[in-house]
């Protein structure tokens, strides 16, 4: 018998406590990460605890305050941005959220050399987007859907576009659907590397149908929010890309970049823009039927002052088994020759890997390979390529950072993170300084997150940037649930799952089971990350077992699993959750009379369909802001996976995959339906239609709406939501309050 000190002695057990719902709602056990704001190869900015903006020099070990908290406070700044010449800082205040990424703000420019705010030719307010040029201190900004340029912060602005109009023409910023489903940014303008040119997108939403919903506010009459929002099969935005010379903007004005002929022949999207040099740019386009993507490299023609995109510099990426790319089509990372690039796409075995393209995609050289996936290319230098993958120990829910030496032949691969803090850290991201001289590693778990600084040449750890000591201490007297990540093999499908078990879990006892599901295409729920959240509380205090399962359609395990749901959303995702539940029951510790499922957004759709599957497995379930019919959701997202809702395409499955079609099947389950009335993303319409179908079928159900709340149900609504859902589940599982 080996005696070892136990963490839980009787005396200690008394001081240990379970998590409370209050802990979760107050964010008591939230963690911090440290992402340096790199400004050179060896310097970064960071906002100190007392809100000073501090510049750190790694090599000298020195630091000094570049901007005082007094200055930040004088304008109530919540964000800042240093100009590359270090002469100015913009200060952002009056933040006003719009959609997921977009917001408006007031901007003030502080002159660091003179120690005062810039006066004269002040910026208008509110501004939709503002950024410095990559060199010097030119400013580009978007105001009232038009783009403006300043050569220096105190100079008068030069207006680049004039046709901007609310909800009609968007210049330099995306419309709703491009922001949410294509660009995943608040901006649609891009400076060339040395600031000579500015590229921007123009989105024309004139013909797009409008979603309108009431915002109740406090006034006598609600106001109506109108958003041009193309639902599946509807008219889409028309996009054009322009480039302007910022040195002499009035000389020839904006020049349009031509769209590749094979793309322009039918409806299409612009998916991303990558500058290669000041006079070479790379644009990516996508057919509306999103299985063909074209990468087009364009060159500036000095003589004509135009941009030329030769057919020889067009690279086609096509998927025959699904859609192009993963969630998005990957973007290229160019090498120093300014023509060849590295890009992640599917190899012949159907795994997403890094390829090197020198001339044609057909002649691409595969850089990584195996039954795992390369996930992100962080940086390419003269001699190294840094990327992340889930290769290590064959756990798809991990992320480690690798370095491939591309300067030597044959290239050698090294895992930078695999053995650093093996138990604590299995899920990393990284942030690199210029030329990858230094980098920060941010570990998200499974242990308490930690951020560290490393030498880019030797990979040596230089210092800990943030180790969450306070959190570690706070958790010392908390009975956290146990977590395990394992896999089920079912009919040649691998189902990875995460199980969250009560602190005193005993396999011989029976526990209520809650399935938390998202399940959307190219998503991943089973990840080796740290979290103290609502489900942690349910396990810790309420004694539930919670399980998350990655079924067909989820990411980073190869195309077979990913593309299995192509054109068939709402089928296999649900089947795989049900299969997993049956396997969990077989494990012997689940009380099969007390099984619930819940999900949000796509997860709300899956949980609704699972409850209405007629299996009798689920006693109850919750759908928060669910999609109920793919005809109600955004074109860009929906059509990627479902095709078009037309008779000659996929209308039949659009109709078959609705929640409403299964209204009768909710009769024998307890269903809680929740939605925000001001959801710009998954419109309240979705839940309204579920409710209508349930009423028409005379099926009893519970519902909660959140007035004027969007898809995130934030603020006080969050507290109300989780309290309400907790009561619902405890009632369902016959747990005393």
């Amino acid at each position: 018998i080996v005696l070892r000190p136990s963490r839980v002695h009787n005396s200690e057990e008394n001081t240990m406590r379970a998590l409370t719902l209050k802990d979760i709602l107050n964010g008591t056990f939230s963690y911090k990460t440290f992402f340096p704001n790199w400004i050179s190869g060896q310097e970064y900015l960071h906002q100190s605890a007392d809100n000073n903006i501090v510049l750190y020099n790694i090599e000298t070990g020195q630091s000094y305050t570049i901007l005082s908290n007094r200055t930040m406070k004088s304008v109530n700044a919540s964000n800042y941005g240093l100009s590359p010449d270090r002469q100015f800082v913009y200060l952002e205040s009056d933040y006003s959220k719009l959609w997921r990424y977009s917001y408006t703000a007031t901007y003030y420019i502080y002159d660091l050399s003179n120690g005062e705010f810039v006066r004269g030719n002040e910026l208008p307010r509110p501004i939709q987007y503002l950024c410095w040029s990559p060199v010097g201190s030119k400013l580009a900004y978007v105001y009232q859907n038009n783009i403006y340029l300043k050569q220096r912060p105190g100079d008068p602005p030069f207006q680049i576009t004039f046709n901007g109009r609310e909800n009609k023409i968007f210049n330099g910023i995306p419309d709703w659907v491009y922001e949410e489903e294509m660009l995943a940014t608040k901006y649609a303008l891009w400076w060339s590397p040395n600031g000579k040119f500015l590229a921007y997108a123009e989105f024309n939403d004139t013909d797009i149908p409008v979603i309108a919903y009431s915002y109740y506010g406090d006034e006598q009459y609600p106001r109506t929010i109108n958003i041009p929002y193309p639902k599946a099969g509807a008219k889409n935005p028309v996009v054009r890309i322009f480039i302007i010379d910022t040195t002499y903007p009035a000389y020839v004005g904006p020049q349009e970049v031509p769209v590749p002929a094979m793309i322009a022949s039918s409806d299409y999207y612009f998916s991303w823009l990558t500058w290669v040099t000041d006079e070479r740019v790379c644009l990516q386009w996508l057919k509306r039927v999103q299985n063909v993507s074209v990468l087009s490299i364009c060159d500036f023609r000095e003589d004509w002052q135009t941009w030329d995109c030769p057919k020889t510099q067009e690279h086609i990426e096509e998927s025959r088994t699904g859609w192009a790319g993963g969630f998005f089509v990957s973007t290229p990372v160019f090498s120093y020759d300014a023509i060849s690039y590295y890009k992640i796409f599917s190899d012949k075995d159907g795994y997403k890997h890094i390829h090197y393209i020198k001339d044609t995609v057909e002649n691409a050289i595969q850089i990584t390979s195996g039954k795992w996936e390369a996930i992100n290319i962080f940086r390419v230098t003269q001699d190294s390529l840094f990327y992340s993958s889930n290769e290590f120990e064959e756990y798809p829910g991990r992320r480690n950072i690798y370095r491939i030496s591309i300067g030597s032949y044959p290239p050698s691969k090294k895992c930078v993170t695999c053995h650093l803090r093996k138990e604590r850290c299995q899920y990393y991201t990284a942030s690199f300084s210029d030329y990858a001289k230094y980098y920060a590693l941010v570990c998200y778990g499974p242990g308490i997150p930690i951020s560290t600084l490393h030498d880019g040449r030797t990979d040596q750890e230089i210092k800990i940037l943030e180790e969450n000591k306070e959190l570690e201490n706070a958790l010392k007297n908390i009975q956290l649930p146990k977590e395990e990540i394992k896999k089920l093999e079912v009919d040649e499908i691998t189902l990875w799952y995460k199980m969250i078990l009560p602190p005193q879990f005993d396999r011989s006892k029976k526990y209520p089971l809650l399935i938390q599901v998202y399940g959307g295409p190219c998503s991943q729920s089973v990840r080796s990350v740290f979290a103290v959240n609502w489900i942690s509380y349910l396990a810790s205090k309420e004694g539930m077992v919670i399980a998350l399962v990655d079924g067909r359609g989820t990411a980073f395990q190869g195309d077979k699993l990913l593309y299995a749901v192509y054109r068939k959303l709402g089928v296999y995702e649900v089947e795989d959750q049900i299969t997993a539940v049956r396997k969990f029951i077989e494990m012997g510790f689940i009380d099969e009379k007390r099984i619930a499922i819940w999900g949000w957004s796509y997860g709300g759709y899956v949980s609704s369909l699972a409850l209405a599957s007629g299996t009798g497995l689920f006693k109850c379930g919750i759908a928060v802001a669910p999609v109920s019919s793919w005809e109600y959701y955004a074109s860009v997202y929906t059509e990627r996976f479902m095709g078009l809702p037309t008779k000659d395409d996929n209308l039949e499955h659009y109709k078959n995959s609705t929640v409403m079609a299964r209204a009768e099947y909710f009769r024998n389950v307890d269903y809680l339906l929740i939605h925000g009335t001001a959801d710009d993303n998954v419109h309240f319409q979705n839940s309204a239609q579920i409710a209508k179908a349930l009423v028409n079928a005379q099926v009893d159900f519970q519902a909660m709406w959140y007035s004027d709340q969007n898809h995130g149900l934030s603020g006080l609504s969050t507290n109300h939501l989780y309290t309400h859902m907790t009561h619902f589940l405890k009632q369902c599982f016959s747990l005393s309050d």
Epitope: L55, Y64, T65, I66, S68, R70, T71, S74, V75, R86, Q87, Y108, D111, L112, S113, N114, G115, E116, F117, V118, R119, G120, E122, G154
Partner: antibody, heavy 124, light 113 residues
Framework: QVQLVQSGAEVKKPGASVKVSCKTS????????IHWVRQAPGQRLEWIGG????????NYNQKFKGRVTITVDTSASTAYMELSSLRSEDTAVYYC?????????????????WGQGTLVTVSS | DIVMTQSPDSLAVSLGERATINCKSS????????????LAWYQQKPGQPPKLLIF???TRESGVPDRFSGSGFGTDFTLTISSLQAEDVAVYYC?????????FGQGTKVEIK
Amino acid sequence: QVQLVQSGAEVKKPGASVKVSCKTSRYTFTEYTIHWVRQAPGQRLEWIGGINPNNGIPNYNQKFKGRVTITVDTSASTAYMELSSLRSEDTAVYYCARRRIAYGYDEGHAMDYWGQGTLVTVSS
Amino acid sequence: DIVMTQSPDSLAVSLGERATINCKSSQSLIYSRNQKNYLAWYQQKPGQPPKLLIFWASTRESGVPDRFSGSGFGTDFTLTISSLQAEDVAVYYCQQYFSYPLTFGQGTKVEIK
């Protein structure tokens, strides 16, 4: 009493460079920017540039850009102004002056204390 | 750049009399956020550096006699010496510190008549 003490008079040949120092005392050096202003015989005062001692970032009048370099040595509470490629028109009295840093967006200060001046004569 | 123009170039006033110097800027020196005028007045005696008299167009620097006053807003400003004293003989400069480059007027020489 606040003091800004400048280095002595200089005589330089055309094409040469001159470096003038400005040693400050009796105030917190990092609370003020240092500016350089010159006055050619019978001419108006002309701003050359300034520097923030907190970060060492200079700001130059475009007219002098490429010819002037302003630096600080915070440990010695001293500012320097170097003017290169001197020509006869650069003959002037060169002053340093301090200006309080404006932390608030509604602030902004004039140059409240000046050095005694340094006569730079450019002659062949 | 903001151009500062003073008038007159020189001024001869009897002791005890009022002296008025005007200064015009090529653009407004009012900052919309605080409605202040970013204009200063300096006095320079022979062989000496300039001395700050007035800032914000009308606020006297501490230690400056109250016979010196500043007024005006936007683009037109005035320095007034209500009762000229012998020690007030000097060249007076206006200066804008609204934006860079900082610029000065050409100066007004005040003498005793």
